[in-house]
């Protein structure tokens, strides 16, 4: 016999909730293998800046980003799967992830804010090897990607520490409209932007930590009302 | 060992068109920008034009817009300049170089070929 | 007129030293993006000499090194030899007018 009344209306929404969970991880690690074994990509590894090889952020960034959609993914079908299925075995296992989930995040977070220094000069790396590629590897598609998201997020346009060639490239192509590189010399600098975003703008990451947080507790509170629904209601 | 070799420069009349073509060797021609640069009778150098290694991004000096288009054939490995609506002051040797990423600056050119503009 | 301005002629007698500067401004070599150097020897096809400022690419002899201050730059050649009597190119690139600029030439003669 199944759940009934509020509890099933709790399966529901669960199951909903993970759902979307599940297809946003998909997407996240979806995007990550293609930036990782994409061809055009891959030359990164081999890149050289002058004479020295390039440093391996880019791949660090896509790696954190598989790791996360394969979480993302496994949790999501765990409270999916064991929603639908009224499993407490499955949502007890998804219970005890989202409780180290939550353990993760917060200790994240902690890290994070000790470490945003450092955080911030590894997403500016990240930035620079990504529009790098864009510009030695004109047909890289995923580096372009890369760095107009950074562009449209940001609301910026390369940096003061540009090369000639990708000052040019940047002003015909790769300027989000609106933006003028060349005026008043990079007042739209992206490294700016990503240290204003790690220092000015820290409580906007905050919120967004905040926001998952409570998502969270709010899915171990589901999961733990559904379990005990489906406990009572096999008792009957 | 590197080589760019210019041809296609000669004399035409102001108002005229001309092709110029750089082939190249001894480089991975297909993974390089290629640049042209021009230097008018004993004057000094100037750039012209720059293309990226697949072609999907190309530049001009102002002098030069709409009048010229730079374009590659990678299969060939060689470089083109199409010049049209030509002016006494195109005039020149025109230089076509490679262009370095890392160094970024003009690394190889050639011997180049010269255009003269004259009626 | 040139973006960069040179000296238009250089000279020295063999074994001196000759130093050719490079002025620009805040939008080209002042803004940070390097300077580098050509050597075009009479009738043939300018070769880099000096690039990022400083570097030498390999086959260039140590007797040939480049600086960078502000918004000039130089080039420096000791131990003159008869065989460097050419013209000599400084090259950034212009963030106002978004195109590689050239020196106007400095032509060095070695003189005796």
């Known amino acids: 016999m199944g759940v009934e009344g509020c509890t099933k209306c709790i399966k529901y929404l669960l199951f909903v909730f993970n759902f979307v969970f599940w297809l946003a991880g998909g997407v996240i690690l979806g995007v990550a293998l293609w930036l990782r074994h994409d061809p055009q990509t891959t030359n990164l590894l081999y890149l050289e800046l002058g004479d020295k090889p390039a440093p391996n952020t880019f791949y660090v960034g896509i790696y954190i980003l598989i790791a996360v959609g394969a979480v993302m993914m496994f949790v999501g079908f765990l409270g999916c799967y064991g929603a639908i299925q009224e499993s407490q075995c499955l949502l007890g296992t998804f219970f005890t992830c989202l409780v180290i989930l939550f353990a993760c995040e917060v200790a994240a977070g902690i890290w994070g804010f000790v470490n945003k220094d450092q955080i911030a000069k590894d997403v500016k790396q990240f930035y620079d090897q990504a529009l790098q590629q864009a510009v030695v590897d004109d047909d890289a598609n995923n580096a372009k990607a890369v760095v107009k998201t950074f562009h449209e997020t940001l609301d910026c346009c390369g940096s003061s520490t540009l090369t000639a060639l990708t000052t040019s490239v940047l002003k015909n192509n790769a300027c989000p409209s609106g933006s003028n590189i060349i005026s008043n010399l990079f007042k739209e600098d992206c490294h700016q932007k990503i240290d204003d975003l790690f220092s000015g703008k820290l409580y906007l990451i905050g919120i967004a930590a905040i926001v998952v947080a409570v998502i969270m507790i709010f899915e171990m509170i589901l999961s733990m009302v559904l379990c005990c629904g489906i406990r009572n209601s096999s008792v009957y | 060992e590197v080589q760019l070799l210019e041809s296609g420069g000669g004399l035409v009349q102001p108002g005229g068109s001309l092709r110029l073509s750089c082939a190249a060797s001894?480089?991975?021609?297909?993974?390089?920008?290629m640049s042209w640069v021009r230097q008018a009778p004993g004057k000094g150098l100037e750039w012209v034009s720059y293309?990226?290694?697949?072609?999907?991004?190309?530049d001009y000096a102002d002098t030069v817009k709409g009048r010229f288009t730079i374009s590659r054939d990678n299969s060939k490995n060689t470089l083109y300049l199409q010049m049209n609506s030509l002016r006494a002051e195109d005039t020149a040797v025109y230089y076509c170089?490679?262009?370095?990423?890392?160094?970024?600056?003009?690394?190889?050119w050639g011997q180049g070929t010269l255009v003269t503009v004259s009626s | 007129q040139s973006v960069l301005t040179q000296p238009p002629s250089a000279s020295g007698t063999p074994g001196q030293r000759v130093t050719i500067s490079c002025t620009g401004s805040t939008s080209n070599i002042g803004a940070g993006y390097d300077t580098h150097w050509y050597q075009q020897l009479p009738g043939t096809a300018p070769k880099l000499l000096i690039y990022?400022?400083?570097n030498r690419p390999s086959g260039v002899p140590d007797r040939f090194s480049g600086s960078k201050s502000g918004t000039s730059a130089s080039l420096a050649i000791s131990g003159l030899r008869t065989e460097d009597e050419a013209d000599y190119y400084c090259?950034?690139?212009?963030?106002?007018?978004?195109?590689?600029?050239f020196g106007g030439g400095t032509k060095l003669t070695v003189l005796g």
């Open positions: 170089a490679s262009y370095s990423y890392g160094r970024d600056s003009f690394d190889y």
């Open positions: 001894g480089f991975t021609f297909s993974s390089n920008y």
């Open positions: 990022g400022n400083s």
């Open positions: 293309i990226s290694s697949s072609s999907s991004y190309t």
């Open positions: 090259q950034s690139y212009d963030t106002n007018l978004s195109v590689w600029v």
